[in-house]
């Protein structure tokens, strides 16, 4: 079976304050079984932004229908962006288990926030 790759095509994304940011992430294989999670930052203190299996995440929506078994697009949209949302976002595949374990990470997308146009 094909080795899973996690593709975050955008190294950086710039969004005006108040707008929505779309962070793209696609995977190349359905295996191993397990959820995709989005985090802001790396290391122990990273913050959970989206998890298929828990929620709600009021400002985050998925771009495609992630509940479909064959779905490989795990892009997210974050609404009403503020300067506090700036940072690097990682799309990460977990292997199903008790607990789920991290399998592979995307390279990250840096979100920068522009001042609201007057």
């Amino acid at each position: 079976e094909e080795e899973l790759q996690i593709i975050q095509p955008d190294k950086s994304v710039s969004v005006a304050a108040g707008e929505s940011a779309i962070l793209h992430c696609t995977i190349t294989s359905l295996f191993p079984v397990g959820p995709i999670q989005w985090f802001r930052g790396a290391g122990p203190a990273r913050v959970l932004i989206y998890n298929q299996r828990q929620g709600p995440f009021p400002r985050v929506t998925t771009v495609s229908e992630t509940t479909k078994r064959e779905n490989m697009d795990f892009s997210i949209s974050i609404s009403n962006i503020t300067p506090a949302d700036a940072g690097t976002y990682y799309c990460i595949k977990f292997r199903k288990g008790s607990p789920d374990t991290e399998f592979k990470s995307g390279a990250g997308t840096e979100l920068s926030v522009r001042a609201k146009p007057s």
Epitope: F39, R40, G41, A42, G43, P44, A45, R46, V47, L48, I49, Q54, G87, P99, D100, E102
Partner: antibody
Framework: DVQLVESGGGLVRPGESLRLSCAAS????????VTWVRQAPGEGLEWVSL???????YYADSVKGRFTISRDNSKSTLYLQMNGLRAEDTAVYYC???????????WGLGTLVTVSS | EIVLTQSPGTLSVSPGERATFSCRAS??????LAWYQQKPGQAPRLLIY???TRATGIPARFSGSRSGTEFTLTISSLQSEDFAVYYC??????????FGGGTKVEIK
């Protein structure tokens, strides 16, 4: 408003155990790493332990093998199980919320642990 | 482990004056340095992170700067509520997260 409330401190003898709790509210507990920091009487701050969003744990060398950090996301509560307590563990223990920048933006008021024979 | 050395240990300043104190890291931490304020009987409060970014709600009289491994916190005009102990903390990506020994700012 973010609130962190520690409990479980008290007076124990050397070698005994104690479990501290920290009840969190005002933020989505499951989404953040949380940490314990202590302060011995009249001394500075010392980082003790951290638990990540995914449950990975980290410890200061001074407590490794004796202390265990854990979290119950369903109760929005952080714990610190302290075994084999020593006199040098006497301190006020604070829990704090950790930002993605690895800084501690909200702190509890602390709970005092005294280890003395 | 990164060691942070704060100086001076105590700083005596009159209200309205400028206060400047420093924190030196034993090895490079980039700009990953934070400052906290602690008043007697209270928990620490985050003031500055990334060497010079003020935390939410922190007044503009607090500012931070960096020169290599030396970091400075400046309070431009001391208010009565600013007399406290100030700690630096390195916040590189991985533990242990170390703190400096603190600088006490007292009324002259």
């Amino acid at each position: 408003d973010v609130q962190l409330v520690e409990s479980g401190g008290g007076l124990v003898r050397p070698g005994e155990s104690l479990r501290l709790s920290c009840a969190a509210s005002g933020f989505t507990f499951t989404n953040y790493a949380v940490t314990w920091v202590r302060q011995a009487p009249g001394e500075g701050l010392e980082w003790v332990s951290l638990i990540s969003v995914t449950g990975t744990t980290y410890y200061a060398d001074s407590v490794k093998g004796r202390f265990t950090i854990s979290r119950d996301n369903s109760k929005s509560t952080l714990y610190l199980q302290m075994n084999g307590l020593r006199a040098e563990d006497t301190a006020v223990y604070y829990c704090a919320k950790v930002t993605w920048k690895n800084v501690f933006d909200y702190w509890g008021l602390g709970t005092l642990v005294t280890v003395s024979s | 482990e990164i060691v942070l050395t704060q100086s001076p240990g105590t700083l005596s300043v009159s209200p309205g004056e400028r206060a400047t104190f420093s924190c030196r890291a034993s090895q490079t931490v980039g700009s990953k340095l934070a400052w906290y304020q602690q008043k007697p009987g209270q928990a620490p409060r985050l003031l500055i992170y990334d060497a010079n970014t003020r935390a939410t709600g922190i007044p503009a009289r607090f500012s931070g700067s960096r020169s290599g491994t030396e970091f400075t916190l400046t309070i431009s005009s001391l208010q009565s509520e600013d007399f406290a102990v100030y700690y630096c903390q390195q916040h590189t990506d991985w533990p242990p997260y170390t703190f400096g020994g603190g600088t006490k700012v007292e009324i002259k």
